[in-house]
Amino acid sequence: CKAMHVAQPAVVLASSRGIASFVCEYASPGKATEVRVTVLRQADSQVTEVCAATYMMGNELTFLDDSICTGTSSGNQVNLTIQGLRAMDTGLYICKVELMYPPPYYLGIGNGTQIYVIDPEPCPDSDF
């Protein structure tokens, strides 16, 4: 079967500092040495790319310097962290994995992780 399954948690709640982390795991049909991971956000039928990184197996993921994502990899598992989230960023975050090299190429897309972001209440001014 020429398919690659991608698993990710159904729901994640961002921290009060606007940070959300989740694991994206893929069942590789081949021995890939180069993998690309993309995080897509789906909200109101609109899809946007949040971040993407290509990495060599055994090496660290490297996102662009201005990316809101960071991550680490371990075997067929990628630990993704998205920072700077606000309530308006609540949505479905989909993990897309591509086995780039060596051939054959494989594509796998997860069902998505619903990330809920709640903006913290502003601290009331305290009287001294």
Epitope: K2, A3, M4, K96, L107, I109
Partner: antibody, heavy 118, light 106 residues
Framework: QVQLVESGGGVVQPGRSLRLSCAAS????????THWVRQAPGKGLEWVAV????????YYADSVKGRFTISRDNSKNTLYLQMNSLRAEDTAVYYC???????????WGQGTMVTVSS | EIVLTQSPGTLSLSPGERATLSCRAS?????LAWYQQKPGQAPRLLIY???SRATGIPDRFSGSGSGTDFTLTISRLEPEDFAVYYC?????????FGQGTKVEIK
């Protein structure tokens, strides 16, 4: 708006070369893999080649391997297909197509006709 | 290489009728798309992921199926729907297309 525009087609003799171009606009070209697909007169669609993102990974159909070279210049938002040792069976309309976020080919160019004939 | 076989080769129907197009894969596929092509035009993406409609595609077009058997259904044919339809798998290389089904006016 989001679009792809091919150019460079024409009539060429067997054994000769031709280079096709595909100009992208309206989207971040470097964020998408881009394919060439061809269609011989009166026939179906045949995938030809793909180049990914930064250009480091390329795949080819067996029918063109060793003869065609796909490349891209992200600074110019342009995709290329260098076709060498052309054969009569390479006669077709050549389309460039974007692999969208979900992997399917969501944007296509209008096509450019290549005729290989003596 | 995954081989996609479409049936029937030609479908003769009248406007307002329902069209059912079939695509069978030589082995199980996870990612299947459907395209529409009119004479002299480029293909247009209709369905991706076997059942998700692409942006701007009318809801009379629907896709279903999994594994090796897939179906494109046009619930009520409009005059502009008479065209050739192709299925494609895109989950692994090489990318392949079916040979196409022509939907013509009866």
């Amino acid at each position: 708006q989001v679009q792809l525009v091919e150019s460079g087609g024409g009539v060429v003799q067997p054994g000769r070369s031709l280079r096709l171009s595909c100009a992208a606009s309206g989207f971040t070209f470097s964020s998408y893999g881009t394919h060439w697909v061809r269609q011989a007169p009166g026939k179906g669609l045949e995938w030809v080649a793909v180049i990914w993102y930064d250009g480091s990974n390329k795949y080819y159909a067996d029918s063109v391997k060793g003869r065609f070279t796909i490349s891209r210049d992200n600074s110019k938002n342009t995709l290329y297909l260098q076709m060498n040792s052309l054969r009569a069976e390479d006669t077709a309309v050549y389309y460039c197509a974007r692999a969208g976020n979900w992997g399917a080919f969501d944007i296509w160019g209008q096509g450019t006709m290549v005729t290989v004939s003596s | 290489e995954i081989v996609l076989t479409q049936s029937p080769g030609t479908l003769s129907l009248s406007p307002g009728e329902r069209a059912t197009l079939s695509c069978r894969a030589s082995q199980s596929v996870s990612y299947l798309a459907w395209y529409q092509q009119k004479p002299g035009q480029a293909p247009r993406l209709l369905i991706y992921g076997a059942s998700s409609r692409a942006t701007g595609i009318p809801d009379r077009f629907s896709g279903s199926g999994s594994g090796t058997d897939f179906t494109l259904t046009i619930s009520r044919l409009e005059p502009e729907d008479f065209a050739v339809y192709y299925c494609q798998h895109y989950g692994s290389s090489p990318w392949t297309f079916g040979q196409g089904t022509k939907v013509e006016i009866k």
